[in-house]
Structure formats: structure tokens, C-alpha cells
Amino acid sequence: GSTVPPMVNVTCSEVSEGNITVTCRASSFYPRNITLTWRQDGVSLSHNTQQWGDVLPDGNGTYQTWVATRIRQGEEQRFTCYMEHSGNHGTHPVPSGNSHHHHHHHH
């Protein structure tokens, strides 16, 4: 089938002790091969500081996955979710302020 670029959505959830969990979700993409990773100041975080979900079919012939990491509250602007899929790539910031959702479709 033809390439379907992912929809990327970044969310934050509050956790204790001044830390937050940021989650980057990629959905509705095809084929299933994708790179999704968190970067701090433009550098990929080491694997042991990130959690990945499996790449799973979403029932529409496309796929979905996610990656999450825990960061210090107030440092959100230093972190981005980096996505590579079928030769395309994109960088997605952590939402700032009161906005806890950010999504973008790659073309």
C-alpha cells in the first residue's frame, strides 16, 4: 500500500516530586517501520530513560505506537519528540503552559 504519514500527539501528565511524564504518540501510519524518540537539547535520550509501546495495528490498516519519558517540571521546552517515517522526519515540542496537548499530521 501507499505511505500514510503518522499523526503525532504530545501530552503531559503530572506526577509527584516536581516531575512530569511526557508521552509522544504516533498513530494512523503505514508502513509500520517508524523511529520515535525523545530528545533533550537536540540529543536523543538514552534508551534506559525512555519507555516504548509496541507498534500495533489500529484496525484501519495502519499502525500506532508511543514513547514516554519523565522530565523535570519547568524544563519542558528542552525536550522534543523526534519522528522518522518513510524518509520523512519531524520534531514535536512538549506543550507549554496550560496546554497539555499538541498534535500534527505529517504530509
Epitope: 536523543s44 538514552s46 530513560t49 524518509g87
Partner: antibody
């Protein structure tokens, strides 16, 4: 002003060890990623190691992996490079560099400290 | 690892000449993670162009950078004496970070 001052270089025998230090001043050290970059005499630049602000992301060049250890002491504003099993090809000027958080890249460099590995 | 190949290795240029050097990556990298440094003999390198096309503070406007994917370049529109130096490209798209082998620019 940002200042990075390396120390600890000198003559080391093959197979020996050496610990380099980089004293940082003029910026909030504990919020910046740091690196070591080296340059052999009359050769090009070679990135050696990276450590992020919280010391939980560390990367090494393949040529030094398993022999060199990068670390930092944030309260003392100091970056370290512990070098073991040194070889003649490790002879180089070692630069401490600060990572640029907004754009990436090495925005500030020290003057370097020379490590010579020779019998 | 991503290998950066710079060409030419050496360039002898006349004053006022346009100078272009290239940096070719062994696999595609994001333009956000490609930078250039200038180094003169006996001195530490300086960040010269960041994120492919942005001039670092104090860099003259005769310098420019461009590129995407696997192909990047640095151009000096009109060569001046102070531009004689070695220029290195560098990527942090993927660890291990790497430098190109450099392009040495001299005055003819």
C-alpha cells in the same frame, strides 16, 4: 563570560590511565550538556563523549567505548574524562565543549589539554 | 555510525573568489542536526554555522550554509584573507556524533 579550562594532560605510557578535568564558569553548569572532543596532531576533530545535564544520557565514540568514562560533578562545576588502557592513537589535544541547548552544536570550547601516549 | 565526507580536502582560493565546500552524509540526517565549525592553526574551533544555515554570532554575512538529507554545503561568497582556515561539518542526528575530515581553505 563562559570559561572552560581543561587540565590533567601530560605524558602517559601505553596501557596507562589519566583523568582529565574541565572547570566551567560563567554559566549554570548543571543545566547544560557537555562533551569531550579531541584532535590528534595535524589531524581533524574527533568527538569523544557526551553527557547530558543530569548524567542519565551518556554517549561515546566507538574508538573509546569501554576505555573512557565521562562524568560530571555539578556542585563543583566540573566535567571529567577518565581514560584507561591508553594507546598511542589516543595522543591528542582534548577539548571540553559546552552543548548549545537551543540549536545544538558545541557553542563554547576550552583551550584544550594535550595528552601524549608514548613509551 | 554516520560518516561525513567533506570535499575538497584542500582549496586554494584567490581573494574575492566564491568558495563552496560540501559535506556528504552516509545516511540521511535532519538539517537541524548539522553544524559547521571554523578552526585556525593554534586555536580552538568555533561554531560557525548552526542547524545547516544559521550563522553563529559574529560570522560575516558572506558565509552561508544550505542542504538537506545527505548533502550539505558551506559557501563563502567572496573570499577574504581572514577566511583562511579549516572548516568541519558535524552531525548529532544519531550517536555516535561525528565530524567530517575537514576542508582546508588557503589564500592563493
Amino acid at each position: 563570560d563562559v570559561h572552560l579550562v581543561e587540565s590533567g594532560g601530560g605524558l602517559v605510557q601505553p596501557g596507562g590511565s589519566r583523568k582529565l578535568s574541565c572547570a566551567a564558569s560563567g554559566f549554570t553548569f548543571n543545566t547544560f550538556g557537555m562533551n569531550w572532543v579531541r584532535q590528534a596532531p595535524e589531524k581533524g576533530l574527533e568527538w569523544v563523549a557526551y553527557i547530558n545535564s543530569g548524567s542519565n544520557t551518556i554517549y561515546y565514540a566507538d574508538t573509546v567505548k569501554g576505555r573512557f568514562t565521562i562524568s560530571r560533578d555539578n556542585p563543583k562545576n566540573t566535567l571529567f574524562l577518565q581514560m584507561t588502557s591508553l594507546r598511542s592513537e589516543d595522543t591528542a589535544m582534548y577539548y571540553c565543549t559546552r552543548w548549545e541547548p537551543v540549536t545544538g552544536g558545541f557553542s563554547y570550547w576550552g583551550q584544550g589539554t594535550l595528552v601524549t601516549v608514548s613509551a | 555510525q554516520i560518516v561525513l565526507t567533506q570535499s575538497p580536502a584542500f582549496k586554494s582560493s584567490s581573494l574575492g573568489e566564491r568558495v563552496t565546500m560540501t559535506c556528504t552524509a552516509s545516511s540521511s540526517i535532519s538539517s537541524s542536526y548539522l553544524h559547521w565549525y571554523q578552526q585556525k592553526p593554534g586555536s580552538s574551533p568555533k561554531l560557525w554555522i548552526y542547524t545547516t544555515s544559521n550563522l553563529a554570532s559574529g560570522v560575516p554575512a558572506r558565509f552561508s550554509g544550505s542542504g538537506s538529507g545527505t548533502s550539505y554545503s558551506l559557501t563563502i561568497s567572496t573570499m577574504e584573507a581572514e577566511d583562511a582556515a579549516t572548516y568541519y561539518c558535524h552531525q548529532h542526528h544519531r550517536s555516535p556524533f561525528t565530524f567530517g575530515s575537514g576542508t582546508k581553505v588557503e589564500i592563493k
